[in-house]
């Protein structure tokens, strides 16, 4: 009679994480009598996966009724596969005895595990940057297998080319991580822009994962200032406006100075938003020219988003206006909302 053979027909099996893996094993004879055991690996530290005779293996079930006397199919199903289950599995026939002794082994089945990458997380620089500067964005995704993965960067749908990507570890592992750094040049129009990291992997069936970062959290568009003198409202009053244009974010503090002395400080509140996401704001100052003997230097000083102040000055010629005697008020705090001006 032909000696018993242990047949593992599948050289390799690939399973998605979370699914069950079926490892096939049949024997060609009922003799000798004895149990089957499954092992992962084959060296001195091999790991027992299933023992037909005894033990508790909650994730392992037999595919056929292995307790039947005539059974020759010892295939097993391992549930809820994770990347840590990858390896080579051996179906081993034992000869009954005290103790049971190993008799024959199958050729082994290599189990590889496909695991989905985590949702990509995109993070930008810690501090805001101004247009024309280059900033770096990072994208990370973890826990995928196999190692092959594709990562692309986009800015508003346009693919970026200036990036570097690493997949770790360098060699084989039960699962992998990807880390990519992209360089993006900011423009004044980028408040509404998005940077997108897109990850494609065999487990995603053509539906890539995306992570996004809004450039509104990264960009700082400094304001442009314009100080203008409005037509005289009364004989002794001049209306001076400071137009603060195209700034982002909104955090802005404006100070009026008369000949270097602080006249009024206010915070931008009711702003108007431009189509590109930047803001405009206007502050105005009523100057009582009769209170001044000499020309007045009016300065609009703006501190934007905690940055060093920028300013614009306007020289008010006092000599051009008749002086009203008895007035001791240099300025009236009558408004700063541009909608009140016109």
């Amino acid at each position: 009679e032909e000696e018993l053979q242990v047949i593992q027909p599948d050289k390799s099996v690939s399973v998605a994480a979370g699914e069950s893996a079926i490892l096939h094993c049949t024997v060609t004879s009922l003799i000798p009598v004895g149990p089957i055991q499954w092992f992962r690996g084959a060296g001195p530290a091999r790991e027992l996966i299933y023992n037909q005779k005894e033990g508790h293996f909650p994730r392992v079930t037999t595919v056929s009724e292995s307790t039947k006397r005539e059974n020759m199919d010892f295939s097993i199903s391992i549930s809820n596969i994770t990347p840590a289950d990858a390896g080579t599995y051996y179906c081993v026939k034992f000869r009954k005895g005290s103790p049971d002794t190993e008799f024959k082994s199958g050729a082994g089945t290599e189990l590889s595990v496909r695991a989905k990458p985590s949702a990509p997380v995109v993070s930008g620089p810690a501090a805001r940057a101004t247009p024309q500067h280059t900033v770096s964005f990072t994208c990370e995704s973890h826990g995928f297998s196999p190692r092959d993965i594709t990562l692309k960067w986009f800015k508003n749908g346009n693919e970026l080319s200036d990036f570097q990507t690493n997949v770790d570890p360098v060699g084989e592992s039960v699962s992998y991580s990807i880390h990519s750094t992209a360089k993006v040049v900011l423009t004044r129009e980028d408040v509404h822009s998005q940077v997108i990291c897109e990850v494609a992997h065999v487990t995603l069936q053509g539906d890539p994962l995306r992570g996004t970062a809004n450039l509104s959290e990264t960009i700082r568009v400094p304001p442009t200032l314009e100080v203008t003198q409005q037509p005289v409202r009364a004989e002794n009053q001049v209306n001076v406006t400071c137009q603060v244009r195209k700034f982002y974010p909104q955090r802005l503090q404006l100070t009026w100075l008369e000949n270097g002395n602080v006249s009024r400080t206010e915070t931008a509140s009711t702003v108007t938003e431009n189509k590109d996401g930047t803001y405009n704001w206007m502050s105005w100052l009523l100057v009582n020219v009769s209170a001044h003997r000499d020309d007045v230097k009016l300065t609009c000083q703006v501190e934007h988003d905690g940055q060093p102040a920028v300013s614009k000055s306007h020289d008010l010629k006092v000599s051009a206006h008749p002086k009203e005697q008895g007035s001791n008020t240099a300025a009236e705090n009558t408004g700063s909302n541009e909608r009140n001006i016109y």
Epitope: G41, A42, P44, P169, V170, G171, E172, S173
Partner: antibody
Framework: QIQLVQSGPELKKPGETVKISCRAS????????MSWVKQAPGKGLRWMGW????????TCADDFKGRFAFSLETSATTAYLQIHNLTNEDTATYFC????????????????WGQGTLVTVSA | DIVMTQSQKFMSTTIRDRVSITCKAS??????VAWYQQKSGQSPKLLIY???NRYTGVPDRFTGSGSGTDFTLTISNMQSEDLADYFC?????????FGSGTKLAIK
């Protein structure tokens, strides 16, 4: 195809140190453990120990503890055997040999071998 | 350590002969045994693993058998290219150990 290519022969004096390299190609280096095997002239094979190429952890057989060290340069897919304070008894051919099992936690048999590096120790 | 004894240091054979090389383990190693062929000046070549499983590409005239402590490598139809040293190896426990080898020569 899978290849293990070892560095060339070495002639050393007693007390010196030798470092042998084993460059792997044709497979992902850190999947499979790497063992080192000694064969003295006209003699049998002796397993010296192995290194887990994923973790970098090495295990030396008792007879080879002390003067023998296994190391890796993962980026170069290369394993190294270093022998310190050489003696005449270290004259042998040294083989690197790859484990059959991906993600294996112990070596078993060896389907792939380097061509061997002859180390001669002579005063 | 487990000692793998190959009592026949040399074996004389003829072409097309049937040759059996034996290996005895000093303690039970189950079926954790491999066999290698080594030709002069070359590295060993794996023939058999798990005592009886032929490695990929190995001609079917090579057969392994045995379990526990007694193992045999059989060459059923000796060819001239089979003249070499043959080593058994156990991987049941650390340290892995090899037999001292059996050299096949032509009568």
């Amino acid at each position: 195809q899978i290849q293990l290519v070892q560095s060339g022969p070495e002639l050393k004096k007693p007390g010196e140190t030798v470092k042998i390299s084993c460059r792997a190609s044709g497979y992902t280096f850190t999947t499979y453990g790497m063992s080192w095997v000694k064969q003295a002239p006209g003699k049998g094979l002796r397993w010296m120990g192995w290194i887990n190429t994923y973790s970098g952890v090495s295990t030396c057989a008792d007879d080879f503890k002390g003067r023998f060290a296994f190391s890796l340069e993962t980026s170069a897919t290369t394993a190294y055997l270093q022998i310190h304070n050489l003696t005449n008894e270290d004259t042998a051919t040294y083989f690197c040999a790859r484990d059959p099992h991906s993600y294996g936690n112990s070596p078993a048999w060896f389907p792939y071998w380097g061509q061997g590096t002859l180390v001669t120790v002579s005063a | 350590d487990i000692v793998m004894t190959q009592s026949q240091k040399f074996m004389s054979t003829t072409i097309r002969d049937r040759v059996s090389i034996t290996c005895k383990a000093s303690q039970n190693v189950g079926i954790s045994v491999a066999w290698y062929q080594q030709k002069s000046g070359q590295s060993p070549k794996l023939l058999i693993y798990s005592a009886s499983n032929r490695y990929t590409g190995v001609p079917d005239r090579f057969t392994g058998s045995g379990s526990g402590t007694d193992f045999t490598l059989t060459i059923s139809n000796m060819q001239s290219e089979d003249l070499a040293d043959y080593f058994c190896q156990q991987y049941s426990s650390y340290p892995l150990t090899f037999g001292s080898g059996t050299k096949l020569a032509i009568k």
